[in-house]
């Protein structure tokens, strides 16, 4: 024999204060004839939430038209939710009787609980820059969510990371919770344009996770490589020497030329270019006057990058009538 079933599909319904909650209830039969009522709680002390026939329920509306004879949808909406509304709600079928209706069957119940959305995740990187091949830590924090169950993932350029530790506080019962996660990321030389993303998924977000981001450009320092070369062509009594500073980040860079140990104060021509990976190249040209010099000229290009120790590269110009071999070496 077919029998009426009361279907309440959601075991748990998370709602936010001030919002409207929809409690679903459908039936599989129009028989026995009689009304469907909503209660909170069970037993003699249960609270009547909605009765279509009698009573005043200003915050409750029905989803369907209950006056339609073959309606099977008895879902209700409760507006302006407050903390006092939490509890388990039951839709209950009554059989028409005399002198009064008799309870026939109850739905399994839907527990209404207050949910709070997590705040937007904030991602913080290291206080100081680090060079490639080293590991840096990023922290992600989100607060004020409930219930406690939450999922946090880390990504670097869309690839999920696995080296992280996460804590949710407090461990016991609370009105709201916080999450803090620390991820360890190995820096690559091309990470100037990279991003780390912290993604937080929570039941209150309805499948639309929150994301916080940090740019690795603020955590990385790519040290430059130096090369000093002498141009093969001589312009009268002047030789053009080039110092190429390649693949550095950030842009902060000081370059000085020294001639036989003496710092040159005069203006030099230079250009700055940006590479596709976000690093920079700096080229500086230095004109050496060799008209009446007999000694070898040693030129030094010294670069101080992002407040780090200076690095330099030397080039010895052997100044003879025929301009003999060039040699260069580097000094840290």
């Amino acid at each position: 024999e077919e029998e009426l079933q009361m279907i309440q599909p959601e075991k748990l319904l998370l709602v936010t204060v001030g919002k409207t909650a929809t409690l679903h209830c459908t039936v599989t039969s129009l028989l026995p004839v009689g009304p469907v009522l909503w209660f909170r709680g069970v037993g003699p002390g249960r609270e009547l939430i909605y009765n279509q026939k009698e009573g005043h329920f200003p915050r409750v509306t029905t989803v369907s038209d209950l006056t339609k004879r073959n309606n099977m949808d008895f879902s209700i909406r409760i507006s302006s939710i407050t903390p006092a509304d939490v509890g388990t709600y039951y839709c209950v079928k009554f059989r028409k009787g005399s002198p009064e209706n008799v309870e026939f069957k109850s739905g399994p119940g839907t527990e209404m609980a207050l949910g709070a959305k997590p705040s937007a995740p904030v991602v913080l990187g290291p206080a100081a820059r680090t060079t490639p091949e080293h590991t840096v830590s990023f922290t992600c924090e989100s607060h004020g969510f409930s219930p406690r169950d939450i999922t946090l993932k880390w990504f670097k350029n869309g690839n999920e990371l696995s080296d992280f530790q996460t804590n949710v506080d407090p461990t016991g019962q609370s009105v709201a919770y916080s999450i803090r996660s620390t991820a360890r990321v190995v820096l690559d030389p091309w990470d100037v344009r990279s991003q780390v993303i912290c993604e937080v998924a929570h039941v209150t977000l309805q499948g639309d996770p929150l994301r916080g981001t940090a740019n690795l450009s603020e955590a990385i320092r790519v040290p430059p490589t130096l090369e000093v070369t002498q141009q093969p062509m001589r312009v009268g009594n002047q030789v053009n020497v080039t110092c190429q500073v390649r693949k550095f980040y950030p842009q902060s860079l000081q370059l000085t030329w020294s001639e036989n140990g003496n710092v040159c104060q005069r203006e030099t021509a230079s250009t700055l270019t940006e590479n596709k990976d976000g690093t920079y190249n700096w080229t500086s040209w230095f004109l050496v006057n060799i008209s009446d010099q007999r000694d070898d000229v040693v030129l030094t290009c010294q670069v101080k990058h992002d407040g780090q120790l200076a690095v330099s590269k030397r080039l010895a110009l052997e100044v003879t009538v025929h301009q003999k071999d060039q040699s260069s070496d580097a000094t840290p």
Epitope: S29, L30, V33, S64, K68, N70, M72, D73, S75
Partner: antibody
Framework: QVQLQESGPGLVKPSQTLSLTCTVS??????????WSWIRQHPGKGLEWIGT???????FYNPSLKSRVTISVDTSKNQFSLKLSSVTAADTAVYYC???????????WGQGTTVTVSS | DIQMTQSPSSLSASVGDRVTITCQAS??????LNWYQQKPGKAPKLLIY???NLATGVPSRFSGSGSGTDFTFTISSLQPEDIATYYC?????????FGGGTKVEIK
């Protein structure tokens, strides 16, 4: 006066998803208390109820098809649709959409569309 | 599922005859029963709802009665345009189910 018109492919390959749309004209699909249904009729056979969606959005499906059926409403287009996944030759039938107004009983029907499942 | 058994499966009658079709439900469905007419190549048409109420625009020669498990559909005076297959449908329990149909022909 409300009229219904089914549309969709007449031929579907086995294991694919059958998708049909019912366009409602002469009235609003979202005005209560109408219920919107899909019914099918196998060649030379009787009628089989597939499922119903209320104007409220609640859906009711035939348990024999429930795992494969989705009925949805697009109020902006004044349409409701049927999706039946993993079809076989046994799903070959004439598919009807129908409306139930205030009174019980499906009082407005589409003219029906024949769907054949074959490779 | 509720089984709806219609009888006869087909019948032949003369114009002006009284035609009766019965529908039996496998369990009590109160009066949650509809009757439909389907002409060849056409969609079904609602004739009777809630076992005995005539749908809008349906001629008064059609009527329905019954409650519980046994229902009757009657055409008081058969007309040539009544050639069709007639179906009962219960909506007391999900899934809604139809009878197997009764094909009415003119002698």
């Amino acid at each position: 006066q409300v009229q219904l018109q089914e549309s969709g492919p007449g031929l579907v390959k086995p294991s694919q998803t059958l998708s049909l749309t019912c366009t409602v004209s002469g009235g609003s699909i979202s005005s209560g208390p109408a219920y919107w249904s899909w019914i099918r009729q196998h060649p030379g056979k009787g009628l089989e109820w597939i499922g119903t969606i209320y104007y409220s959005g609640s859906t009711f499906y035939n348990p024999s098809l429930k795992s494969r059926v989705t009925i949805s409403v697009d109020t902006s287009k004044n349409q409701f649709s049927l999706k039946l996944s993993s079809v076989t030759a046994a799903d070959t039938a004439v598919y009807y959409c129908a409306r139930e107004g205030y009174h019980s009983g499906m009082d407005v029907w589409g003219q029906g569309t024949t769907v054949t499942v074959s490779s | 599922d509720i089984q709806m058994t219609q009888s006869p499966s087909s019948l032949s009658a003369s114009v002006g005859d009284r035609v009766t079709i019965t529908c039996q439900a496998s369990q009590d469905i109160s009066n949650y029963l509809n009757w439909y007419q389907q002409k060849p190549g056409k969609a079904p048409k609602l004739l009777i709802y809630d076992a005995s109420n005539l749908a809008t625009g349906v001629p008064s020669r059609f009527s329905g009665s019954g409650s519980g498990t046994d229902f009757t559909f009657t055409i008081s005076s058969l007309q040539p345009e009544d050639i069709a297959t007639y179906y009962c449908q219960q909506f007391a329990y999900l899934p809604w189910t139809f009878g197997g149909g009764t094909k009415v022909e003119i002698k």
